[in-house]
């Protein structure tokens, strides 16, 4: 950056090189060039010469003043016009930054995705700071008082093998940057209470012709958790409102859920599960599309595939969709 140049003088910023966005700031330039009494001192921001708000303080020093500075980053340098010198002489340069102190981190959430071997902790960092902001995640055992700290710039994955202080912990997040430091409330967790079962996936659908046609949705999960509660939501693609069905599920076999749907309509399905009685849900599964037949029986399956409708009696395809849903982050 500009801070690496060889200087023939000094440039400094008041109140500081990193300051709160919207502040009034002063940039000072002091020349120390051999055999040069500067005729004029010039300031450049991002390579463009500044023309206003420059005050000469004395023979070697000038000040550039900015009101309500709003740029997150700028490269400043200053030059001198020396007698008998054809070009301006570089004095020095500095990178400056403006931003905000961190907000108090809130909505601290820690979950263990089954089979991941990690505890994943996330939080709401608040408003954008524009400057380098680091987060320290504190994990303190309620049983041994031992505390681990993890430095990160966003979320954190903590190996469950490193959590050797029992099952109960406090977790909190400290946010810090050049303009301030804040700390979240403490979240109390029990490792057994924050496990999210292995993802539930809708594999196929079929509509069976009967007196009243019914659609069967086939879905499964690789979870080893015994007591699992699930929700399946569905709607016509033209609708805004979801219908939700609840299930207490045992995943020793593929689940089959029955729906009585309107004919000749394209529906979308999603499923999510949680360990029964626990706090956190899986994110909703990928969108799974199924179009009910007009009257003829059809076997169909579609998760974000292109339409493959035949004029024949049956249309069959395997669910391959892995596009994330509109509610991917909904774990609470």
């Amino acid at each position: 950056g500009i801070t690496n140049i060889n200087c023939s003088g000094h440039i400094w910023v008041e109140p500081a090189t990193i300051f709160k966005m919207g502040m009034n700031i002063s940039i000072y330039c002091q020349a120390a060039i051999k055999n040069c009494q500067p005729r004029k001192l010039h300031f450049y921001k991002n390579g463009i010469k500044e023309r206003f708000q420059i005050t000469r303080i004395n023979k070697t020093t000038a000040r550039l003043w900015y009101k309500n500075f709003l740029e997150p980053h700028a490269s400043m340098y200053c030059t001198a016009e020396c007698p008998k010198h054809f070009q301006e002489t570089l004095i020095c340069g500095k990178d400056i930054s403006s931003g905000y102190p961190p907000d108090i981190p809130d909505e601290v959430t820690c979950v263990i995705y089954e089979y991941s071997g990690n505890m994943t902790c996330t939080w709401n960092a608040g408003k954008l700071t524009y400057i380098d902001t680091k987060y320290v995640v504190h994990v303190k055992s309620l049983e041994t008082e031992e505390e681990q700290q993890y430095l990160t710039s966003s979320y954190i994955n903590i190996s469950t093998d490193s959590l050797q202080g029992g099952k109960k912990y406090l977790v909190w997040v400290q946010a810090a940057n050049a303009l301030g430091m804040e700390e979240s409330k403490q979240l109390q967790i029990h490792l057994d209470d924050i496990v999210i079962p292995s993802a539930a996936v809708i594999s196929r659908a079929e509509t069976i012709n009967a007196t009243v046609p019914k659609t069967i949705i086939y879905w499964d999960s690789q979870t080893t958790i015994e007591k699992v509660s699930c929700e399946m939501r569905y709607k016509a693609t033209t609708n805004q409102t979801w219908n939700v069905k609840e299930f207490d599920t045992n995943f020793t076999y593929v689940q089959q859920s029955e729906f009585y749907l309107e004919p000749n309509i394209k529906y979308v399905f999603q499923v999510r599960c949680q360990e029964t009685g626990k706090r956190y849900w899986q994110p909703w599964s990928s969108l799974f599309f199924h179009k009910t037949p007009e009257t003829v029986p059809q076997v169909t399956s579609k998760a974000f595939q292109h339409d493959t409708w035949n004029s024949g009696l049956t249309v069959a395809s395997i669910s391959t969709g892995h596009l994330t849903s509109d509610n991917r982050g909904d774990i609470g």
């Epitope: 041994t144 430095l151 406090l170 400290q174 403490q186």
Partner: antibody, heavy 121, light 112 residues
Framework: QVQLVQSGAEVKKPGSSVKVSCKAS?????????MCWVRQAPGQGLEWMGC?????????YYANWAKGRVTITADESTSTAYMELSSLRSEDTAVYYC????????????WGQGTLVTVSS | DIQMTQSPSSLSASVGDRVTITCQAS??????LAWYQQKPGKAPKLLIY???KLAAGVPSRFSGSGSGTDFTLTISSLQPEDFATYYC??????????????FGTGTKVTVL
């Protein structure tokens, strides 16, 4: 068994700075630990000054009153922690202790012998 | 800012007496509380940690109880060597930017 050995007594002028050292033996420097500093003015109670956390990264924490005046550092190569207090005034006359449990808990099983710092003009 | 309020500030008792000292935190500190004994000219000595766990080498006449905000140190039968000043200390977290002191103000136990 952790042992903490502090530097000797100091007499300082108001406005100057003092740096007290605390050499630790018996701490596993590969593990996470807190090293903290506590002071006690003559006839007064214990006053927490701050701590340094040493682990995969280093973090320092200071009492509200100590911010800007106290700097705590650790030199892992010599197993020594330091506490520097600047802008000394007469009310900083106290015995200064380093304290730790040799791990990442905040209660203190082990204390240094104390360093008397006298601030006088 | 978590504040630690210790009471009484001093008490007089006789050998064999049961002595109780209380410490109150201004917010929930779970069981993260320690008790220390200090004698004149000496560094403090850890008696109790995690509110109720006895530190190594501490006689069983010392006990601690409480969680959340209210804590108690009890000496079941005061011995001559127990005349000293006792301090509580919150050991929950020191990362909070607004902490002033983590110790209580102290309780001086003197001979009646």
């Amino acid at each position: 068994q952790v042992q903490l050995v502090q530097s000797g007594a100091e007499v300082k002028k108001p406005g100057s700075s003092v740096k007290v050292s605390c050499k630790a033996s018996g701490i596993d420097f590969n593990s996470n630990y807190y090293m903290c500093w506590v002071r006690q003015a003559p006839g007064q109670g214990l006053e927490w000054m701050g701590c340094i956390y040493v682990g995969s990264h280093v973090n320092t924490y200071y009492a509200n009153w100590a911010k800007g005046r106290v700097t705590i550092t650790a030199d892992e190569s010599t197993s020594t922690a330091y506490m520097e207090l600047s802008s000394l005034r007469s009310e900083d006359t106290a015995v200064y202790y380093c304290a730790t449990s040799g791990s990442s808990v905040l209660y203190f099983k082990f204390w240094g012998q104390g360093t008397l710092v006298t601030v006088s003009s | 800012d978590i504040q630690m309020t210790q009471s009484p500030s001093s008490l007089s008792a006789s050998v064999g007496d049961r002595v109780t000292i209380t410490c109150q935190a201004s917010e929930n500190i779970y069981s993260f509380l320690a008790w220390y004994q200090q004698k004149p000219g000496k560094a403090p000595k850890l008696l109790i940690y995690s509110a109720s766990k006895l530190a190594a080498g501490v006689p069983s006449r010392f006990s601690g109880s409480g969680s959340g905000t209210d804590f108690t140190l009890t000496i079941s039968s005061l011995q001559p060597e127990d005349f000293a000043t006792y301090y509580c200390q919150q050991t929950n977290r020191y990362s909070n930017p607004d902490i002033y002191n983590v110790f209580g103000t102290g309780t001086k136990v003197t001979v009646l």
